[in-house]
């Protein structure tokens, strides 16, 4: 089915929501004063070999559980991430964006990445797809 202007707009809004969530996480943790940053950086994430289409979000979906585990370390009284809710929201967006019709086997790069590199990669991906839609 050819994409309509309304479906394109919906996709764009969902990507913008995903982008904001990922940026919020990154801004919340990537602060040199964050007492747990160095320890959070010891966790490793798998990066997609290729991420140019919405179906590649399968690679993000598969890393959401490890992401939640690291975010459990990031809470503070003045920074309420609520990792479970946040990851659940991201998961819903990712499922809608990638679609459930086609099963895509994610291919990962050989090198693992830190949480900061991982988030930056998916932020760049979201920005790239948004730019093709506008």
């Amino acid at each position: 089915m050819a994409p309509t202007s309304s479906s394109t707009k919906k996709t764009q809004l969902q990507l913008e929501h995903l982008l904001l969530d990922l940026q919020m996480i990154l801004n919340g943790i990537n602060n040199y004063k964050n007492p747990k940053l160095t320890r959070m950086l010891t966790f490793k994430f798998y990066m997609p070999k290729k991420a140019t289409e919405l179906k590649h979000l399968q690679c993000l979906e598969e890393e959401l559980k490890p992401l939640e585990e690291v975010l459990n370390l990031a809470q503070s009284k003045n920074f309420h991430l609520r990792p479970r809710d946040l990851i659940s929201n991201i998961n819903v967006i990712v499922l809608e964006l990638k679609g459930s019709e086609t099963t895509f086997m994610c291919e990962y790069a050989d090198e693992t990445a830190t949480i900061v590199e991982f988030l930056n990669r998916w932020i760049t991906f979201s920005q790239s797809i948004i730019s093709t839609l506008t």
Epitope: P35, K36, R39, T42, E69, N72, L73, K77, N78
Partner: antibody, heavy 121, light 111 residues
Framework: EVQLVQSGAEVKKPGESLKISCKGS????????IEWVRQMPGKGLEWMGV????????YYNEKFKGQVTISADKSISTAYLQWSSLKASDTAMYYC??????????????WGQGTTVTVSS | AIRLTQSPSSFSASTGDRVTITCKAS??????????MNWYQQKPGKAPKLLIY???NLESGVPSRFSGSGSGTDFTLTISSLQSEDFATYYC?????????FGGGTKVEIK
């Protein structure tokens, strides 16, 4: 019962290599970071470095970087601290400890019993 | 690195005494409303044992006579009524900045 059991006391000569161990039990070893702490005779405690047994990722105190290597084998729930060339000044008690950092906290809740390392010619 | 200065470095006390140990940090160990200061007890030949985490939280299984308070740079460990098993060395530790650092210790001896 959650515990960390360290290898026994070691007596070595300067220049020799050494690898001491810290075995976790009673919990999911890969899910918690393990830290190493040094206590020289009659002195206080010094943080050396940390390992994530799940990923193998490490972070060292600058003071100990290049002096020791921290590693882990998650298949046998064991973390290691090793020296390639010991010095007399490495004589100390070495502790491993489990790091807890969920929520608003960061502390060591479980400690190994310690491994005494004596380096003397 | 953050320096932690404990005082006194040692003192004698009797069972039943109220004991207060202070720990002063060279800079704040607070982050976004939380104080990253912990207290440990160490007996001769034994590993340290966690007493208090995040300045004032009592670790599970630790007697309620132990309490912690403070924020920023000034922290206190209080033992409301000293028991014979409390004669030991006490260390404060900051976990706000790497490298994590410990105070020099306070040795509580029997009078």
């Amino acid at each position: 019962e959650v515990q960390l059991v360290q290898s026994g006391a070691e007596v070595k000569k300067p220049g020799e290599s050494l690898k001491i161990s810290c075995k976790g039990s009673g919990y999911a070893f890969s899910n918690y970071l393990i830290e190493w702490v040094r206590q020289m005779p009659g002195k206080g405690l010094e943080w050396m470095g940390v390992i994530n047994p799940g990923s193998g990722g490490t972070y060292y105190n600058e003071k100990f970087k290049g002096q020791v290597t921290i590693s882990a084998d998650k298949s046998i729930s064991t973390a290691y601290l090793q020296w390639s060339s010991l010095k007399a000044s490495d004589t100390a008690m070495y502790y491993c400890a489990r790091w807890r950092g969920e929520g608003y906290y960061a502390y060591y809740d479980v400690w190994g019993q310690g491994t005494t390392v004596t380096v003397s010619s | 690195a953050i320096r932690l200065t404990q005082s006194p470095s040692s003192f004698s006390a009797s069972t039943g005494d109220r004991v207060t140990i202070t720990c002063k940090a060279s800079q704040s160990v607070d982050y976004q409303g939380d104080s990253y200061m912990n207290w440990y007890q160490q007996k001769p030949g034994k590993a340290p044992k966690l007493l208090i985490y995040s300045a004032s939280n009592l670790e599970s299984g630790v007697p309620s006579r132990f309490s912690g308070s403070g924020s920023g740079t000034d922290f206190t460990l209080t033992i409301s009524s000293l028991q014979s098993e409390d004669f030991a060395t006490y260390y404060c530790q900051q976990s706000n900045e790497d490298p994590y650092t410990f105070g020099g210790g306070t040795k509580v001896e029997i009078k």
